[in-house]
């Protein structure tokens, strides 16, 4: 571990003296002196600072631009930034969620492994043997082939990853 520095936690060193940092939600107005404490002021509306700091300006809250498909997930405070997420059917293009794109659909032959959220895209998987998907969808999983046997029918046409099996009546034995 790093050895302790001359100023304690929540202090900073300036001109050979340790001054108190400003608490989250406040900005620095003036450093302490030998005779006065650090002077801090609360951040204004739509501003924030999320750490103990010596910043002279607060940061602006993030703007969730509806033109980019964004909406407010959590309103910012003086100590926290606004959190944006995407409108229904869309997801963020990055961790910072600065813009949104439409959820991906899984093509025929692929099913939805994980439905998209506001921050992650649809995850598709190929339909394994015994399953199919005949639609392009952002929600549909691979469906199991119909079981002809349970319906007392026989397979007339084999299923694929894109099509269900076709069942038909069993051939009657001629007398």
């Amino acid at each position: 571990p790093e050895p302790p520095t001359a100023c304690r936690e929540k202090q900073y060193l300036i001109n050979s003296q340790c001054c108190s940092l400003c608490q989250p939600g406040q900005k620095l107005v003036s450093d302490c002196t030998e005779f006065t404490e650090t002077e801090c002021l609360p951040c204004g509306e739509s501003e924030f600072l999320d750490t103990w700091n010596r910043e002279t300006h607060c940061h602006q809250h993030k703007y969730c631009d509806p033109n980019l498909g964004l909406r407010v997930q959590q309103k910012g405070t003086s100590e926290t930034d606004t959190i944006c997420t995407c409108e229904e059917g869309w997801h963020c293009t990055s961790e910072a969620c600065e813009s949104c794109v439409l959820h991906r659909s899984c093509s025929p032959g692929f099913g939805v492994k994980q439905i998209a959220t506001g921050v992650s895209d649809t995850i598709c998987e190929p339909c394994p043997v015994g399953f199919f998907s005949n639609v392009s969808s952002a929600f549909e999983k691979c469906h199991p082939w119909t079981s002809c046997e349970t319906k007392d029918l026989v397979v007339q046409q084999a299923g694929t990853n894109k099509t269900d099996v076709v069942c038909g009546p069993q051939d009657r034995l001629r007398a």
Epitope: P3, P4, T5, A6, C7, R8, L13, I14, N15, S16, Q17, C18, T33, E34
Partner: antibody, heavy 116, light 107 residues
Framework: QVQLQQSGAELVRPGTSVKVSCKAS????????IEWAKQRPGQGLEWIGV????????NYNEKIKDRATLTADKSSSTAYMQLSSLTSEDSAVYFC?????????WGQGTLVTVSA | EIQLTQTTSSLSASLGDRVTISCRAS??????LNWYQQKPDGTIKLLLN???RLHSGVPSRFSGSGSGTDFFLTISNLEQDDIATYFC?????????FGGGTKLEIK
């Protein structure tokens, strides 16, 4: 009144170490940082480091931090600077000073001569 | 590290003169600039801190100005007792650094 009394001149051999003391009086020792600086003959001042006598925490000049050790003894209101692996480049006057908006009060200086 | 440049290493002035010594920082240091006086016997005293605040016990003949990168120490009505070397020092960013000094002599 504020006073910083430093230890006397030292003549030391190359490769050895030296420990300079700085006894503070006239104020609350733990309430102010103690700064240390070096002045080679006919030259400017070079900052060595700073110690907080209250916590024992310190910051050093990167150029010298591997060889300098700052300590403080609250019971005797005395700060110390130890410098090891001395060379002729370390021959200088060493000053302690009280912090608090610059180096507000200075010791009289301690001459350290490194010579074989 | 921040460099402090005192362009005039020595200057001569007459008793009663007004003398100005400059100090330039290599980057913005706001007002974290201190001035010191070192007498010929080696003793050092703080004259001004935070660029312009007179330290206790320092005669009002000494004044300081400047902010950012350019700073000035002015001695009005120069006295014999002012014969010394004057250093500037920045307290904005570690490592603290000093100017090279300006030696003041009497003509």
């Amino acid at each position: 009144q504020v006073q910083l009394q430093q230890s006397g001149a030292e003549l030391v051999r190359p490769g050895t170490s030296v420990k300079v003391s700085c006894k503070a009086s006239g104020y609350a020792f733990s309430d102010y940082l103690i700064e240390w600086a070096k002045q080679r003959p006919g030259q400017g001042l070079e900052w060595i480091g700073v110690i907080n006598p209250g916590s024992g925490g310190s910051n050093y000049n990167e150029k010298i931090k591997d060889r300098a050790t700052l300590t403080a003894d609250k019971s005797s209101s005395t700060a110390y600077m130890q410098l090891s692996s001395l060379t002729s480049e370390d021959s200088a006057v060493y000053f302690c000073a009280r912090g608090g908006g610059g180096f507000t009060y200075w010791g009289q200086g301690t001459l350290v001569t490194v010579s074989a | 590290e921040i460099q402090l440049t005192q362009t005039t290493s020595s200057l001569s002035a007459s008793l009663g003169d007004r003398v100005t010594i400059s100090c330039r920082a290599s980057q913005d240091i706001s007002n974290y600039l201190n001035w010191y006086q070192q007498k010929p016997d080696g003793t050092i005293k703080l004259l001004l801190n935070f660029a312009s605040r007179l330290h206790s016990g320092v005669p009002s003949r000494f004044s300081g100005s400047g902010s950012g990168t350019d700073f000035f120490l002015t001695i009005s009505n120069l006295e014999q007792d002012d014969i010394a070397t004057y250093f500037c020092q920045q307290g904005s960013t570690l490592p603290w650094t000093f100017g090279g000094g300006t030696k003041l002599e009497i003509k």
